[in-house]
Interface confidence: medium
Amino acid sequence: HKSSSQGQDRHMIRMRQLIDIVDQLKNYVNDLVPEFLPAPEDVETNCEWSAFSCFQKAQLKSANTGNNERIINVSIKKLKRKPPSTNAGRRQKHRLTCPSCDSYEKKPPKEFLERFKSLLQKMIHQHLSSRTHGSEDS
């Protein structure tokens, strides 16, 4: 279905951009508030979207030091932008069995960003394999 596949592509491009933004932020890790943030790891299958929302809700902040503050704030804002939803995302929203954000181990910004990237990669790979098998549900 044309419009569905177009939506899927849009979703993939946004997810792909998020990986680049995380990579960019990692270069400014010393300019981030060194606060410990919930950082999901080894996320249970079907809880990826729940974990993704935990990363988005986390209070990642610029330390307001120097010239990088504006670009860091812009990128954090972009990280929080909601990607186009997929069937899987809609389905997972209704699951009540996923861990709460507070239950995940808290990590400093560097590890937080590494784990976020890892989850994004997992979600992209799942998405690609689901498309290969003719499904738009994961």
Epitope: Q6, I19, D20, D23, K78, L79, I124
Partner: antibody, heavy 120, light 107 residues
Framework: EVQLVESGGGLVKPGGSLRLSCAAS????????MNWVRQAPGKGLEWVSS????????HYADSVKGRFTISRDNAKNSLYLQMNSLRAEDTAVYYC?????????????WGQGTTVTVSS | AIQLTQSPSSLSASVGDRVTITCRAS??????LAWYQQKPGKAPKILIH???SLESGVPSRFSGSGSGTDFTLTISSLQPEDFATYYC?????????FGQGTKLEIK
Amino acid sequence: EVQLVESGGGLVKPGGSLRLSCAASGFIFSSYSMNWVRQAPGKGLEWVSSITSGSYYIHYADSVKGRFTISRDNAKNSLYLQMNSLRAEDTAVYYCVRERGWGYYGMDVWGQGTTVTVSS
Amino acid sequence: AIQLTQSPSSLSASVGDRVTITCRASQDIDSALAWYQQKPGKAPKILIHDASSLESGVPSRFSGSGSGTDFTLTISSLQPEDFATYYCQQFNSYPYTFGQGTKLEIK
């Protein structure tokens, strides 16, 4: 200064191969998605391929799929395009292009281009 | 693939004129569109990203608007250095595609 410099273009016979390189400087190369865009003589722009910052996600135009391979070496600040089974219609100026960062849509840094001519 | 149709294909105008170039997408592309300027023998240069955001260093006489399927690039008062070819490009889905270009010539 933010800069992209392409090399590797030249004259090749149909069915032959070429490897284009792009040297990046003046920015954190490993943070950006990169693209190849081409322009045939007297024609418009055609997107060829893209690769994400960590090489996790790659796409090709249908016209080059199965023949061209994009890759990057972040340690060397370099982008590559391996072109095999070249055809006359691949004759073009090939641009190495940085995709605009921080989640925005656009290609903000372009190299000067390298010319590929496929002819017998 | 999403097709982008630019109009007009060519345009003659004078210094000081207000010029509008349109780009129509075959499907909804949200605001995932950029505009470029290219002069003969040179690489393209980005003018507008995200449909309406002016790229840093680009003169304010350039502006972009639109969302969905219809987009416009406007030059409020043409300068001699603006005579060039202009392209739109979509980033909504693969393959990324460009419009066929609009050549802006001196009248």
